[in-house]
Every structure is written in C-alpha cells, then in structure tokens.
Interface confidence: low
C-alpha cells in the first residue's frame, strides 16, 4: 500500500479539518513554548503544501516523508535556539534521528502558566467572533501542556468543547450550562492524558512486547467471546496505532485508528455484542466509544484453565514450540475469565506462570514441578485485594481530603527526596482513587483501583526521570512495569534520609490565603504538610494531625479577622513556634 506522496495520502484520508488539527497538535507537542500564531502559520503552510501534492503527487518535495516535511518546517522557526536551547541541535541531524531527537526533548512538565478560565461572556464572544481560531487555541493549549496526549482523541475533546459552547452560549444561564461541561472536559482530559502517557512509557521504556501483553489482557477482558486469533489481530493493530501516536506520527496514527474502528464495526459478531451502539456514531465519537466500551459477558461454558495449562502432559511441549504464543494464549484465557482482576495483576500472573515453566520444563519431572503453579498465584491475587480493601476502608473513614493527607504522609516518608510539588500532585491524585473506585461493586474495585494507580505512579516516574533524586524511585520505576505499584507499596520510611532543615519562610502565610478556592487552600495546606514530614520524617500521625488542625484553625481565624494581613503577621510566628514544639 505505497503512495507516491505520503502527505497527499494522509490529507485525502483524513480530510482538511482533521489534517490541520492533527498537524497543529503535532507541532504544539514538539515546540511547546512557541506562540499560537507561529504554529498556525506553520500549519497553514503545511496544509497549502499538502494541497499542491493532492493536485499533483509528482510535484517537488511531495515524495518526502512526513517526518522530513514536518521536521524541515519546525526547523524554520527563527527563535529555536533562544527558546529551546539544545533542542535546536536536532535540526543538524538527518531523519530518523532528527525526529527521535525532537521526541526526546518533549517536556512532561513544561514551564507554562496554568490556564485561567475567562468569564463566560468573554469566552462566548470569542467563540462567536472566530470559532475556528477559538478551537485551534484549545488544541494548541492542551497539546503543549500534554505532549503525549492521544491526538485523535484530542480531536474528539475539541468536538465536545465546540458542542458545549454552541449549546451553552445560546442558553438563558450560560454559566450554569457551560461551567459543569468545561469541568468535566478538563477532568476527563487530564485522565485521558495520564492514561496515554502510561501507554507511551510502556512502549518507549519496556518495548512493544510489554504493551502487547497489556493489550492482550485488557482486550481479552473486554471481549471474552472473541477468539485468541481475533484478539491478537486487534492487539497488533492497536499497538501500531499507539506506537505511531507515541512516536509523533499523528496523521498515520489517526488514519490507522479510523481503520481499526472500521474493522471492529465490520466484525462485531466475532468481537463483542457491546459494539453495536458505538458503531452507529460518527468517526471521532465511534473510536472513543469503542475504546471505552464495557466488558462483554463471559461465555457461560468456559472450561477450567487447569486442563490445558497445568494438568496436560503437553504443557512443556506447547510452551517450547512457541513460547510467546503459548503465554499469550494463557494470558488471554486467564483475562477473559477474570474481569475482576486488574490488568497489572493478570500480567504478574502470566510472568509467574512463565517463570514456573522456565524452571519446571528443565526439571526431571516437569509435570510434578508445575502441578501446583496455580497455588502460587494466591499471594499475588491477595496482595492487591487486601490493599484495595484496607485503603477503601481508610477512605470511607477519612473522606477524600484527609485520605489524600494520609497518602501524602505515607509517600513523603517513603521518598522524601522527591520535590514537594510532585509529592503533592501525585498524592492528591492517588487519593482520588477512593472516590473513583471504592463506591464500585467488589468485582470492579481492583481493576479500577490498581490500574488507576499504575497511571498515577507513571506520572511520578515520568517527572522523576526528568530530575532524578531518589534511587528508590528509579528502582521502582525502571525494574518492572507490572510491579511498579507493589514496589512503591513495599517501600518503608527512608532511614537514610537526612531531615530537611526548618525554614520559617516555608510556613509563612499571608492574607491572600483567604481568597483562594477550596482546592487551592487544600494544596497550600498539603504543601505545608509535606514540608513538615520532610522536616520531621518520624513524626507520628497524632503529632501531624495536631499541627494540621492548628493550621486550619489559624487560617480560619485570620480569614475572619478585620485586618487579615496583620493577623497572619502576628499569629503566623506563634503557629510556627507551637508546631516546632509539638514536633520536638
């Protein structure tokens, strides 16, 4: 399926609107600091060029690869050296090294100001004045802050963003209509970004084999009626899609994702009974719906796994003949029977099974050796079950904010070298697992909780890789993808850590505290809590609770005072002194 002009091929496949959107996302994810207008100019130039190639595929430069065309265009940016420093050196390289170089310079934590939401009337005016620019700005702002956001999915978010404004800017109460929709899009967008970041980390750090194993497990849970060959085909196609998107090949990725959706909808009968309602939707919605589709019902008559994978005398023969296929089938068979297990647990079980076969198939009596292999799974299954049970009980007892605080303390004690903003961000997100998963029925709790925690811990790993400060974090992040969460869970208080010197400035607060939103107040208090633990890592729960209660009382008192700033100036040092005494 070769084309004279790749850019013409993709333009025709995707259509002008999606082509332009994806090129804007690609450029914004690579050059995260460039102004919006610069990117729009580059996108327009690329689009005009693509149109000339559609008209004549033999025209000059139309035969160049997309990486060459896009890279050449990015390297025309005049301020590359001043804005990006050594990233400008990428432009001296040839493809494919140049693209690899750009990928390596993607910044997961770019130094960009937080997005401020203007007044609703201001947004509606901007939307009506120039809808196209308004939506491009959305793609640009999200893409530059989330350089691994799944590009075709971002087009779907932009379509929903547009629909929200189109509906709500006509409404009687614009704000009541629009703000909840924007909040939902923001929260879903952050979650989507984090999930995709784990997929890219899996591919880039652990290879496509790791991603494929994840995909076999997840798709087998979703499509338990599908045959292994069907699941394998979907896994191969899905891996291609995500490899492309994670590699910056966004046009190919979106095109292949559309092909995959088409294939799934044409072959519903051999995949899942749940696809029907997705397949009636337009493309972006259809792909999103297929990705989020609920698990199909398990076939009623599935035989015991033990027959083929434990009791059979041919286990070692079958394993030796095609190890990866045999293990893939084991993973498929186990996962389709266990929608109640997290994907990460299923992968641990497959790893344990593989290790047992490696050992036993070389033994004098292999069958005797692996006969009890399923018994060895028990502790692996019980560990996340107990963890979910204990943490959900704690969440129900404390509520979300205090549950987050418990996790803040726990994780600061484990890895006190990690920066305070990172500890606050990660622990707050870990704490959200309670509201997200603990209300679910028992059978859905573990897959919800552990697979969500994997996504959050990947964020810690990604941020830590940029500025490594803790050998423990590096070890947990790099040794095994499937064992990251158990690795972090197993970390204890870092005895080697030298407590941080007390800095009164860290605990000095001002009247601006009073005008902060509830969330911002929480973040301020949680930042102080992390700093306290870094100063006194061996402080007890009771001591820390006492200090935090005093802190809340002190802030509440001063925010009610007539002269708030004077109150903070007078009461602040007293609070600091009392806290030091309480922790001594």
């Amino acid at each position: 399926d070769t084309h004279k002009s790749e850019v013409a091929h993709r333009f025709k496949d995707l259509g002008e609107e999606h082509f332009k959107g994806l090129v804007l996302v690609a450029f914004s994810q690579y050059l995260q600091q460039c102004p919006f207008e610069e990117h729009v100019k580059l996108v327009n130039e690329v689009t005009e060029f693509a149109k000339t190639c559609v008209a004549d595929e033999s025209a000059e430069n139309c035969d160049k690869s997309l990486h060459t065309l896009f890279g050449d265009k990015l390297c025309t940016v005049a301020t590359l050296r001043e804005t990006y420093g050594e990233m400008a050196d990428c432009c001296a390289k040839q493809e494919p090294e140049r693209n690899e170089c750009f990928l390596q310079h993607k910044d997961d934590n770019p130094n960009l100001p937080p997005l401020v939401r203007p007044e609703v009337d201001v947004m509606c005016t901007a939307f009506h004045d120039n809808e196209a620019t308004f939506l491009k700005k959305y793609l640009y702002e999200v893409a530059r802050r989330h350089p691994y956001f799944y590009a075709p999915e971002l087009l779907f978010f932009a379509a929903r963003y547009k629909a929200a404004f189109a509906e709500c800017c006509q409404a009687a109460d614009k704000a009541a209509c629009l703000l909840p929709k924007l909040d939902e899009l923001r929260d879903e967008g952050k979650a989507s970004s984090a999930k995709q970041r784990l997929k890219c980390a899996s591919l880039q750090k652990f290879g496509d084999r790791a991603f494929k194993a994840w995909a076999v497990a997840r798709l087998s849970q979703k499509f338990p009626k599908a045959e292994f060959a069907e699941v394998s085909k979907l896994v191969t196609d899905l891996t291609k899609v995500h490899t492309e998107c994670c590699h910056g090949d966004l046009l190919e990725c979106a095109d292949d994702r559309a092909d995959l959706a088409k294939y799934m909808c044409e072959n519903q009968d051999s995949i899942s009974s749940k696809l029907k309602e997705c397949c009636d939707k337009p493309l972006l919605e259809k792909s999103h719906c297929l990705a989020e589709v609920e698990n199909d019902e398990m076939p009623a008559d599935l035989p015991s796994l033990a027959a083929d994978y434990v009791e059979s005398k041919d286990v070692c023969k079958n394993y030796a003949e095609a190890k990866d296929v045999f293990l893939g089938m084991f993973l498929y068979e186990y996962a389709r029977r266990h929608p109640d297990y997290s994907v990460m647990l299923l992968l641990r079980l497959a790893k344990a099974y593989e290790a047992t076969l490696e050992k036993c198939c070389a033994a004098a009596d292999p069958h005797e050796c692996y006969a009890k292999v399923f018994d060895e799974f028990q502790p692996l299954v019980e560990e996340p079950q107990n963890l979910v049970k204990q943490n959900c009980e704690l969440f129900e007892q404390l509520g979300e904010y205090k549950f987050q605080n418990a996790l803040l303390v726990r994780y600061t004690k484990k890895v006190p070298q990690v920066s305070t903003p990172t500890l606050v961000e990660v622990s707050r997100n870990l704490g959200k697992v309670g509201a997200k998963c603990c209300k679910l029925p028992e059978a859905k709790r573990m897959p919800c909780a552990e697979d969500y925690l994997s996504v959050v811990l990947n964020r810690l790993c990604v941020l830590h890789e940029k500025t490594p400060v803790s050998e423990k974090v590096t070890k947990c992040c790099t040794e095994s993808l499937v064992n990251r969460r158990p690795c972090f869970s197993a970390l204890e208080l870092d005895e080697a850590y030298v407590p941080k010197a007390f800095n009164a400035e860290t605990f000095t607060f001002h009247a601006d505290m009073c005008t902060l939103s509830e969330k911002e107040k929480q973040v301020k208090k949680q930042t102080a809590l992390v700093e306290l633990v870094k100063h006194k890592p061996k402080a007890t729960k009771e001591q820390l609770k006492g200090v935090m209660d005093n802190f809340a009382a002190f802030v509440e008192k001063c925010c009610k005072a007539d002269d708030k700033e004077a109150c903070f100036a007078e009461e602040g040092p007293k609070f600091v002194a009392a806290s030091q005494a309480a922790l001594a």
């Epitope: 494919p96 084999r209 896994v235 191969t236 095609a322």
Partner: nanobody, 124 residues
Amino acid sequence: EVQLVESGGGVVQPGGSLRLSCAASGSTISSYVMGWFRRAPGKEREFVAAISRSGGYTYYADSVKGRFTISRDNSKKTAYLQMNSLRPEDTALYYCAAGRYSAWYSQSYEYDYWGQGTLVTVSS
C-alpha cells in the same frame, strides 16, 4: 520499502561457526524488529531469533539458545546472526525478516519484508 539481502552462508563442519549478515536498503532499519527464520529441506519455515528495534530485547528458539546470537547495527542498516557449535540439523536456508509491528517476534506472519535467503550446510 525495505529490501533485505542475506550473506555469509556456506558449508561448515559440525561444531564450526558462521556469521550471517542481513543488509537493508531503501530505508533505515531502526523502525523494524529484525528476525531470522530458516527452512530445512522438506520442513516448514521456523523461527530462529529476533531482536527489538533498539537492540535491547532478543529472543531465540529453544533449539538455538546458547549457540546463536542475534545483533544489529542500525547505523550500518545491518542485522547479524552469529552461529556457533553448529549441528547437522542446523542445515537450512536462512531468511532475514523485518517487521514494523511484531507482536510476538516469533510468528512469521508479523514480518513485513523478507530476504531471498542464504544457504547454510553443516556436514562432515
């Protein structure tokens, strides 16, 4: 589009060594998983070894594990198969293959491009 050309085959005595090379033209190989397969006279084609794109992951058929080593040099657009302690049953036509998105590495259907093969004969 990738064209693959194998070389290095020949006749060798049992216990001897050979190094096969697979040179790619038309495109870089850094985007491809590289694999070696073989077909013995009158038998099905079988997987021998494979190496991931970066070279960080290698996979071998049990029958060659410990004797064969696969490697790659992306800058030279070449993959290699070092074969030591050769046995008569290693006699076969050896094919090099490149797969953009190989799922299991050992399945021939997952490789997109194939060479013509180079003959290895192990005989005393």
